[in-house]
């Protein structure tokens, strides 16, 4: 099949006092193999600090995966989440607030 | 092979500004974080900042915030550093580098001399 | 600010010998941000080790890293030639970051 670009979603949540939990979600993207990643100041945060989500079909021919990861509050602007998917590759910023969410489509 | 070509030695009176180039190349211009040092004359390393070119966003070292301003040009795969209200304090070499997978500085450019002399 | 000590400023050594450099830090950090660069006179810097104790593409082995929380250790087993120069530790755990003074290894 042709490529399909991912779409990526960063969600927060409150955590423990004083921490939050960061979500990047990507999905309806094919083929399967995909780069998703949480960075610290551009640098990629070691693994033993995320949680990755299996690759998985999402029903429509194409598949979904997510990573997390727990940073301090207030910090949020250190950290994004980078994609790398069939030779493209996007990064994406935390959202200010618990009500925003940011979809974006990569071509 | 990923190299960061720098601008050349520039010679400023007190109050001016400068301009600092830096073209990476050899991978995505977008895919990695620019961060500027410099390094004073038989000193060490100080971070300026950095700025990620795919979203724009910057980072400031506090002490640099008010005269220093990071730019990147995408069309053109450029970063550059500004730095106004010269003082001879600020006579140094001026790196630009990239963000590495598991460092902040893995490759970095060749250096510019700023002199500050009126 | 989160400052690092580099200790001893200068260290007088001959080819062949061991060096050992520190970094002491002010604060706690995790073994994940604390980095070393090698840089030689009129040179840029250039990765050594990264993440503590992980040589970066094309460091030769005699160069190792150790640490944890505040101290962290560079050591050259067997001192080369090209070996000579200034060497830098580097946090990124907090902003800013920031580097040590730096040790120069100098031929004695």
């Known amino acids: 099949g042709s490529t399909v670009p991912p779409m990526v979603n960063v969600t927060r949540s409150e955590a423990s006092e004083g921490n939050i939990t960061v979500t990047c979600r990507a999905s309806s993207f094919y083929p399967r193999n995909i780069i998703l990643t949480w960075r610290q100041d551009g640098v990629s945060l070691s693994h033993d600090t995320q949680q990755w989500g299996d690759v998985l079909p999402d029903g429509n021919g194409t598949y979904q995966t997510w990573v997390a990861t727990r940073i301090c509050r207030g910090e949020e602007q250190r950290f994004t989440c980078y994609m790398e998917h069939s030779g493209n590759h996007s990064t994406h910023p935390v959202p200010s607030g618990n009500s925003h969410h940011h979809h974006h489509h990569h071509h | 092979e990923i190299q960061l070509v720098q601008s050349g030695a520039e010679v400023k009176k007190p109050g001016a500004s400068v301009k600092v180039s830096c073209k990476p190349s050899g991978y995505a211009f977008t895919s990695n974080n620019i961060y500027w040092v410099r390094q004073a004359p038989g000193q060490g390393l100080e971070w300026i900042g950095y700025i990620d070119p795919y979203i724009g966003r910057i980072i400031y070292n506090q002490q640099f915030k008010d005269r220093a301003t990071l730019t990147v040009d995408k069309s053109t795969s450029t970063a550059y550093l500004e730095l106004s209200s010269l003082r001879s304090e600020d006579t140094a070499v001026y790196y630009c580098?990239?963000?590495?997978?598991?460092?902040?500085?893995?490759?970095w450019g060749q250096g510019t001399l700023v002199t500050v002399s009126s | 600010e989160i400052v690092l000590t580099q200790s001893p400023a200068t260290l007088s050594l001959s080819p062949g010998e061991r060096a050992t450099l520190s970094c002491s830090a002010s604060?706690?950090?995790?073994?994940?941000?604390l980095h070393w660069y090698q840089q030689k006179p009129g040179q840029s810097p250039r990765l050594l080790i990264y993440r503590t104790s992980n040589l970066a593409s094309g460091v030769p082995a005699r160069f190792s890293g150790s640490g944890s929380g505040t101290d962290y250790t560079l050591t050259i087993s067997s001192l080369e030639p090209e070996d000579f120069a200034v060497y830098y530790c580097q946090q990124g755990g907090s902003l800013p970051l920031t580097f040590g003074q730096g040790t120069k290894v100098e031929i004695k």
């Open positions: 604060s706690s950090i995790s073994s994940n941000y």
């Open positions: 580098s990239r963000s590495g997978e598991r460092s902040n500085f893995d490759y």
